[in-house]
């Protein structure tokens, strides 16, 4: 029959080539001369010419060694034609199966594999998977079937069989207990992949197993006892650095220390933080300590880690005895800022107030006083008693030194400690108004026409406070009332000056007396420029010249 069973050809054949494979034969060759040909990839299409057929004999030839890993199967068609070219058979399928030779070694996908596993894990824990490939056939033969094994382990501590590898999957697992990062942080395994399911060619690679840190070591204080000296009143003062050792991985949560004041800080005076680099506990004062109240504190500090312990571990405790050192504390004015009401213009030598300070120190220290800042120089202070007296005229209306009726003075108290310390207080004198200023008109110079003159409105000001101001009263003196009139408006805060008789062009003094609600009188001379003009004028016109 015009049929060919699949032809098996081993790869890497040594020849000689051409090499006979099979003879195509049609039983029609009894009747007529038959010519044979083949088509398909490997014959008349790429890769061309690998196979050929002798036209007259039908012998199928192989022209070169085959490579299964390149092409594992060739599908050709055999053709049979008569001398005249007519097809005498249907095209016949010719399958050429390239059988595998173990011509490839296994290859690991990496030279070095890296994996990690937590210290202290139980046997059976998976670490990593390694992979080797083999280009040979692993379906019909064992040529490409890879078996994995561990050739060696370094270091061999605690013993040389800490890991196992699954011979088929390449999964590396822990086989023994005793992984301790603090003793062996990394294992190097030489792994093997062997084809023929373990009986063939071998290749090696390295698997590096990093042992990850677990928090299986507690931080320990070293030393456990500390003595520190702290000056009283210091806030944020570093009291002591507490040192711990921890065998776990530096700068990991299992190593980083967390400190807690367990006892001895009833007043919440202390705080403890962890130094980010040294891991030390930095004990500092949160509030100032008071030597006079308590001169020694005994603190108990416990240390743990940021990460929880993976097993029950005893915690380490440190004892810190903090000695509070006495400091010569500054006297403190009571109150720190003192408000005193005093009438302006009081006589010199008149007492203003007594302003004293207290010393927190228990020794009976002598306090002396002096004025630190008195801008106007109006006051004096008794160094022993703290008595403040007036030595100048207190003037509420002095805009240079008084703001919103308040004159501010800074005083100083100094103790006789060694070295002496000082404290300051602020004395706020609220000056009570006295009617010591009369009313003043504005402006004090006017220009007015001598014909149909416009009334001149002058504003009245008084530096004093109510009730020592409006309503004001006006009166003309020194015969000024012959030519002028002065009237205060209804509100009582302006005076209207009018020219009631003709005056020739010239400059005149108008004597105006103004008095406030408290009858404080002030005489003001108004310079009036009278012009030859009608109605409103600002400056006198020049003399008229005819032309």
């Amino acid at each position: 029959d015009w049929v060919v069973a699949p032809i098996s050809v081993p790869e890497n054949g040594k020849g000689p080539f051409p090499q006979r494979l099979n003879q195509l034969k049609s039983n029609k060759d009894r009747d007529t001369k038959i010519f044979y040909s083949i088509t398909g990839p490997g014959a008349d299409s790429p890769p061309e010419g690998v196979f050929a057929v002798e036209k007259e004999t039908g012998w199928l030839l192989l022209n070169k060694p085959l490579d299964r890993e390149e092409i594992a199967k060739y599908e050709l068609f055999g053709h049979a034609v008569s001398e005249n070219g007519a097809s005498v058979e249907d095209p016949m399928n010719i399958s050429i199966i390239v059988t595998d030779q173990n011509d490839h070694k296994p290859k690991f996908t990496q030279d070095t594999f890296r994996g990690s596993v937590l210290e202290g894990v139980l046997p059976g824990t998976s670490v990593m998977q390694v992979t080797a490939t083999d280009e040979d056939d692993a379906i019909y033969t064992y040529n490409g079937v890879v078996a994995y094994s561990i050739h060696s382990q370094e270091p061999k501590d605690p013993h040389d069989l800490m890991f196992t590898i699954h011979r088929s999957t390449g999964t590396i697992s822990v086989i023994s207990s005793g992984l301790d990062r603090e003793k062996v942080p990394e294992y190097t395994l030489t792994i093997q992949a062997t084809d023929m399911d373990g009986d063939g060619s071998t290749t090696t690679a390295v698997a590096v197993v990093e042992i990850l840190d677990a928090n299986d070591n507690a931080p320990m204080f070293d030393p456990q006892k500390y003595e520190a000296h702290v000056p009283e009143n210091a806030v944020g003062h570093e009291v002591q650095r507490l040192t711990v050792t921890d065998l776990d991985a530096p700068n990991s949560p299992a190593w980083r220390a967390t400190y807690l004041i367990m006892g001895g800080d009833d007043g919440d005076h202390f705080t403890i933080t962890t130094h980010p680099e040294s891991n030390q506990g930095i004990l500092t004062t949160r509030k100032g300590l008071d030597f006079e109240a308590k001169n020694q504190h005994t603190l108990y500090v416990e240390v743990t880690n940021e990460a929880p312990f993976v097993l029950k571990l005893p915690t380490s405790t440190a004892t810190i005895v903090v000695h509070v050192e006495d400091v010569n504390e500054a006297p403190v004015f009571v109150p720190p800022s003192k408000v005193v009401e005093v009438q302006e213009g009081i006589p010199t030598g008149e007492p203003v107030c007594v302003y004293t300070a207290e010393d927190p120190d228990k020794e009976n220290q002598k306090i002396s006083y002096r004025i630190l800042r008195d801008p106007a120089g109006w006051l004096a202070m008794d160094p022993d008693s703290g008595q403040v007296t007036a030595v100048g005229t207190l003037d509420r209306e002095d805009e240079q030194f008084v703001r919103n009726n308040i004159y501010e003075v800074m005083v100083l108290a100094m103790d006789n400690g060694s070295p002496p310390t000082t404290g300051t207080g602020t004395l706020l004198l609220t000056l009570i108004d006295v009617n010591d200023h009369g009313p003043v008109p504005e402006p004090r110079q006017i220009t007015i026409c001598n014909q149909s003159p416009v009334r001149q409105v002058l504003n009245i000001t008084d530096k004093d406070l109510s009730p020592h101001t409006s309503p004001f009263q006006a009166q003309l003196t020194d015969d000024s009332d012959i030519y002028w009139t002065a009237e205060v408006n209804e509100e009582g805060d302006t005076v209207v000056l009018s020219l009631k008789k003709f005056l020739k062009q010239d400059t005149y003094d108008v004597h105006l007396s103004l008095s406030d609600h408290g009858n404080k009188e002030q005489l003001t001379v108004i310079r009036a420029t009278v012009c030859d003009c009608h109605g409103h004028v600002e400056t006198c016109p020049g003399p008229w010249k005819g032309g």
Epitope: K14, P16, P18, G49, A52, E54, E56, T57, W59, L61
Partner: antibody, heavy 118, light 107 residues
Framework: EVQLLESGGGLVKPGGSLRLSCAAS????????MSWVRQAPGKGLEWVAT????????YYPDSVKGRFTISRDNSKNTLYLQMNSLRAEDTAVYYC???????????WGQGTLVTVSS | DIQMTQSPSTLSASLGDRVTITCRAS??????LIWLQQKPGKAPKRLIY???SLDSGVPSRFSGSGSGTEFTLTISSLQPDDFATYYC?????????FGGGTKVEIK
Amino acid sequence: EVQLLESGGGLVKPGGSLRLSCAASGFTFSSYAMSWVRQAPGKGLEWVATISSGGHYTYYPDSVKGRFTISRDNSKNTLYLQMNSLRAEDTAVYYCASYYYGIPFGYWGQGTLVTVSS
Amino acid sequence: DIQMTQSPSTLSASLGDRVTITCRASQDIGINLIWLQQKPGKAPKRLIYDTSSLDSGVPSRFSGSGSGTEFTLTISSLQPDDFATYYCLQYGSSPLTFGGGTKVEIK
């Protein structure tokens, strides 16, 4: 009738080159592997080169590899042997021969003499 | 390379004699062996392929046998046309190698 006719032989100096030809007729030249075989005077036969039917693949023994090149022109039904760097020991009658039944040397030419001498 | 050792190198025989020529391969070549006949001044001619298959037109007095490493060519009744030199050739391994030849001459 199968006929193979060699030509191109002659006298050549050592180190010289020569190209032999083999004209084929009487069979489908393009579907048969072809070879060259030589026979030194009074000596036995020695295989020199083979080429696949399509001309894609060539094969040589170590004795001539790198010096001799076999080729074919299927459109002209002609086989060639280019011989370079000729040596005295290459002196022989050179036969072209065809594969037949998938195995060597079913048909032979009458041969052409190559003499390498100074 | 596979060495082919032919024996004898020369053989004297009479017409009608049964003649046997031996070819020994240095390695197993299966049945990949041909026998060639060469007459003086002529091209060789293939007689037998695949150890024992006769080429077309070759008289039936010629036969071949053997496999592996030991092969024989037998002429059952020597004829005048049979006086020639006979060569074996192995094509089981590359390179193709010939035997040294056996010259059959008239006794």
